[in-house]
Each structure stands twice: as C-alpha cells, then as structure tokens.
C-alpha cells in the first residue's frame, strides 16, 4: 500500500507490456533509482513469447520465473516462464506474480501477516523514523473508475498510473508519487529479488515499455550478483 514504508510504492493499475518486465525496488542511497511493480497482473499475455534461457529466477523479467518448460523436464534446460497468477499451483514464491506468494502449493495474494520484501541488488538502508512500519503490498490491475480526470504530465502528483498521461507511470519520488516516463530500450532498470528486506526505497523508475523486458545485460553475466546491470531489452 502507498503508505507502507517498506515496498510501499507499487505502481498501481497499469497493464504491463508483453512479457511484462518491470523495474523493482530501488535503493535509499543508490544513484540509479529503482522501482516496484504491482501485484498479480491479469493482462499478461504470452503470444509470440520468446523463450529466454536462464539459470536462476533473478535472470528473468519481473513477471517471470526460471524453470524447465515441461513438467519433469530436464532441469538443465531452463527458460523464463510467465509467473503464476493467483490460485495457480506453485512450488516456490518466485513462481507467483508480484503481489502474491506461494502458500501450500497455491499462489495466494500477499497479506499483512506475510512479509514479502524485495531488495535491489545495490545498497539499501533502514531508516529509524516513526514511519518505519512493516507492511506488504497487494495491488489490483483494474482500470480506474475515473476516466475523465485530467491525466498528469511528468512530475504531476499521482496515486496510480492511470492518473498519468500516456507514456508515464506513477512512481515514487522520495516519500510521494509522481508521474515519470516509462523506460525505453537500453535504459537501466532494476531487477527485483524475491527476498526479504528491511531496506527503504526512495526512488522508482517506471517499468520497461511495450515489447521490452528488464534483463541482465549479456556482457554482465560474469559480473558479481551485486553489480549486475539490467537494461530494458527487446524480447
């Protein structure tokens, strides 16, 4: 939820592009802002989906996980698969779409009693102020009921991406949310990790634009986990 200090800035109410990779939580002190993507996405399609080989979940887009494409298939041949939506079967949290987690073999909506932190690969920092409330996020992707509300331009105040004009998303800037540009091909994005964190992100970037996924740069595959660069790339 917006008011949660921890992972509070889910970009609300935006159908993601094909293959739906979005950016993820940024760092409180990182030079490159990060972003967080909302809960289970009902718009994702896998038409013309280009398989992307992987070895771990972190190499896949936000709305993907790394696994063998066939049941009981060769574990050595793994690709990025579309995340599992609510009420779908799962074996681990990473299989479930953002805003959900794996409970008793089923993807269920994240709730207040289950902590789902996500951290960026760069630095995060805990802030000991009176707002440091632990809270999760659960986001819908329904269209806004108020379609006639003037769409915000870059920098405008917003609560969800439908408050912003085309090509912009609603993303956090410090402690509030403003309309920011959707990322273009080649721009740096932040890969999420489905791990706990007491870090506090202050900045968000938007997710990658249509037809793009946030993936590790090929020439950075050998880099250490903490410094791998992710950019918006064509599927």
């Amino acid at each position: 939820t917006l008011n949660s200090v921890l992972n509070s800035n889910a970009i609300k109410n935006l159908p993601p592009p094909l293959g739906g990779a979005a950016g993820h939580p940024g760092s409180a002190v990182s030079a490159a802002p990060g972003i967080l993507y909302p809960g289970g996405n009902k718009y994702q399609t896998i038409d013309n989906y280009q398989p992307y080989p992987c070895a771990e979940d972190e190499e896949c887009g936000t709305d993907e996980y790394c696994a063998s494409p066939t049941r009981g298939g060769d574990a050595g041949v793994q690709i990025c698969l579309a995340c599992r939506k609510r009420r779908k079967r799962c074996m681990r949290h990473a299989m479930c779409c953002p805003g959900n987690y794996c409970k008793n073999g089923i993807c269920v909506s994240s709730d207040q009693n289950h902590f789902r932190g996500e951290i960026e690969e760069t630095i995060t920092e805990s802030f000991g102020n009176d707002h440091s409330t632990l809270d999760g996020y659960s986001r819908r992707t329904t269209l806004s009921s108020k379609m006639y509300h003037t769409k915000g331009q870059e920098g405008s105040v917003c609560l969800r991406s439908s408050d912003c004009a085309s090509g912009l998303c609603c993303a956090r800037h410090f402690w509030s949310k403003i309309c920011k540009p959707v990322l273009k091909e080649g721009q740096v994005c932040t890969k999420h990790r489905r791990k706990g964190s007491h870090g506090l992100e202050i900045f968000q970037r938007c997710y990658c634009g249509e037809g793009l996924s946030c993936r590790i740069q090929k020439d950075h595959h050998q880099a250490s986990n903490s410094s791998r660069l992710h950019t918006c790339q064509r599927h």
Partner: antibody
Framework: EVQLLQSAAEVKRPGESLRISCKTS????????MHWVRQMPGKELEWMGG????????SYNQKFKGHVTISVDKSSSTAYLQWSSLKASDAAMYYC??????????WGQGTLVTVSS | DTVLTQSPASLAVSPGQRATITCITS??????MNWYQQKPGQPPKLLIS???TLRPGVPARFSSSGSGTDFTLTINPVEANDTANYYC?????????FGQGTKLEIK
C-alpha cells in the same frame, strides 16, 4: 519536529484575490507532496489538489480546477493556495497537509477564509 | 470519483464500550483506506493509514479492518477524550475522497 504553519485568517470581499500560505519546517520540503484540503463550516473534508515541490507538478480535484492555483516556493519551503477572484462559496477552513506515501500525515492548523460583501 | 459512504452519521457510546464506524467505497480500493480524528477547532489527526496500519503514538484502542470496498474503524474501549468527528479517506486513486464523517459522542 515536522511543522506546517499556515497564514492567519482572512476576511475578503467577493471578486478579490487571495493567497494563503503554508510554511513548513522539520523535514526536506521537496521530498513530499503538499495537499490542500477544504472544510466548509460544519461539513466534511474535500481534497482540492496537491503539488510535488520536486518539479512543481500539480494535480487538482476537477471541482476546484481553474478556480484555485497551488504553487510552492522551494527557497522558503512554503506552499501556497491562491484565488484570483473569490466567491462567497469559498468561505471555509483551508488546511495544508503533507503527503507521506499516500496518507496525509501532518496538517497545518488551518486558515479560515471569510468571504462577505 | 470513488464515493465513500460513512455510517453512522453520529453515535453515542458509554466509556468502556466499543464504537464501530464503517466506510463503504464505490470502487475497490484494496486496503488504501486512512482514518482521521478531528476535534473541534483542530486539524484532522491521522490515526490509521493504508494497510490498517496504526500510526505511531496512536493508542492501540484504535484499530481498523477491511479491504476492497468495506472498511471498519473500531475504538475499544472508548474513552471520554475520544469525542470527535471521524473521517475515512481513500488514497487509491485521484481525486482523494473523504467520507461524510461520523460524530462520536461519549455518554
């Protein structure tokens, strides 16, 4: 300590202009959106609009758009609510409120605007 | 706009009893509901923010529940200084909208 100090009460005539202020302290002004909320006598609260000082980006409630202007002066960490031509129906208590991740957590003490001919 | 229907408009509760205020929204707003207390001559005070999160310094007597369209603020037990108007506020989509308010009176 976060503080939002609003300007004193105003008594105006219809058609006159007015600018009320909200001077902030105790936090980094450019890091939080500032909202303006109206409360007519004995009535509920109404969100008028907000401004993010970072780029000066605003968003208005359609009900108030075009009738009021929200602005900021970053150098003095102050937010403003302005009317170019007041109406009798603008008589109300006006609050500035700081945004904290969607909620309005700190509020000014309010500025009472009286519009009477 | 998301319309918030708050009820009851007023209620009177004896000290030590439970007070319950409800807020129903015209659209699904997840858990993006906030609750405020406003005493005469004062600005609203944030009691509970999104995700049913009790704000620092607010007594645990105040609690809230709900998500989607149905929300409840509970004060249990009520104390004499809880006399005030209470408002719900949705922060899910612009424009922000408030409930009409509930006047709580302590018998």
């Amino acid at each position: 300590e976060v503080q939002l100090l609003q300007s004193a009460a105003e008594v105006k005539r219809p058609g006159e202009s007015l600018r009320i202020s909200c001077k902030t302290s105790g936090y980094s002004f450019t890091e939080n959106t500032m909202h303006w909320v109206r409360q007519m006598p004995g009535k509920e609260l109404e969100w008028m609009g907000g401004i993010n000082p970072h780029k000066g980006g605003t968003s208005y409630n359609q009900k108030f758009k075009g009738h009021v202007t929200i602005s900021v002066d970053k150098s003095s960490s102050t937010a403003y609510l302005q009317w170019s031509s007041l109406k009798a129906s603008d008589a109300a208590m006006y609050y500035c409120a700081r945004d904290w991740l969607g909620a309005m957590d700190y509020w000014g003490q309010g500025t009472l605007v009286t519009v009477s001919s | 706009d998301t319309v918030l229907t708050q009820s009851p408009a007023s209620l009177a509760v004896s000290p030590g009893q439970r007070a319950t205020i409800t807020c129903i929204t015209s659209t699904d707003i997840d858990d993006d509901m906030n609750w405020y207390q406003q005493k005469p001559g004062q600005p609203p005070k944030l009691l509970i923010s999104e995700g049913n999160t009790l704000r620092p310094g607010v007594p645990a007597r105040f609690s809230s529940s709900g998500s989607g369209t149905d929300f409840t603020l509970t004060i249990n037990p009520v104390e004499a200084n809880d006399t005030a108007n209470y408002y719900c506020l949705q922060s899910d989509n612009l424009p922000y909208t408030f409930g009409q308010g509930t006047k709580l009176e302590i018998k």
